[in-house]
Amino acid sequence: MNGRVDYLVTEEEINLTRGPSGLGFNIVGGTDQQYVSNDSGIYVSRIKENGAAALDGRLQEGDKILSVNGQDLKNLLHQDAVDLFRNAGYAVSLRVQHRLQVQNGPIGHRGEGDPSG
């Protein structure tokens, strides 16, 4: 594994409470806007300062969101995914996939750039 970069994929359930300005993040992806090659999944593109997601601290830019309030985000158009978040209510449960860069054994910093590596 010398000099090789691998990725550790973990999943987490994140419960957010919608703040005064909403959930506080942006997304990319969808069947009409593939962000990662051969993957029409929904990814977090930006966490907004002082928003609900930033204050909670667990959701990270580059995370893949698998479901919202138990509803799967597979095979959704981009706008349909956006609408799902906007209509998700006050308490929002996100199932997310984190992708951590691992180099020479120990866990390193989160990989930058295109999540496809």
Epitope: L23, G24, N26, I27, Q33, S45, R46, H78, Q79, F85
Partner: nanobody, 125 residues
Framework: EVQLVESGGGLVQPGGSVRVSCVSS????????IGWFRQAPGKEREGVSC???????YYVDSVKGRFTISRDNAKNTVYLQMNSLKPEDTAVYYC????????????????????WGQGTQVTVS
């Protein structure tokens, strides 16, 4: 370094037309929402038009049917074509960019943007 540069403003007669452009550098437009905003003297900055990350266009009611937003990803440029201009359209016009789509509001909301240009003056007189 991310940069947005507006151009194309100027002095226009009422009823006239002008096209303003916003050229981006330091990132590619794919996956970005781009908004046009304006600020008249003594007034707050307001959303005029925007195009979301999948190319859907939005307009504030006061410019619907007169303004048209378009994007050319190959040129990293977004345009705002303004027709049938009125004196009340006089303002500094700014473009702004945001990576992805906000899950909270449409791209007409200026609080969602983190990159801004310096603006270009449009005077209708």
């Amino acid at each position: 370094e991310v940069q947005l540069v507006e151009s194309g403003g100027g002095l226009v007669q009422p009823g006239g037309s002008v096209r303003v452009s916003c050229v981006s550098s330091g990132f590619i437009l794919d996956y970005y929402a781009i908004g046009w905003f304006r600020q008249a003297p003594g007034k707050e900055r307001e959303g005029v038009s925007c195009i979301d990350s999948v190319g859907r266009a939005y307009y504030v009611d006061s410019v619907k049917g007169r303004f048209t937003i378009s994007r050319d990803n190959a040129k990293n440029t977004v345009y705002l074509q303004m027709n049938s201009l009125k004196p009340e359209d006089t303002a500094v016009y700014y473009c702004a960019a945001d990576f992805g789509s906000s899950v909270d509001s449409t791209c007409l909301n200026n609080q969602q943007y983190n990159y801004w240009g310096q603006g270009t003056q449009v005077t209708v007189s």
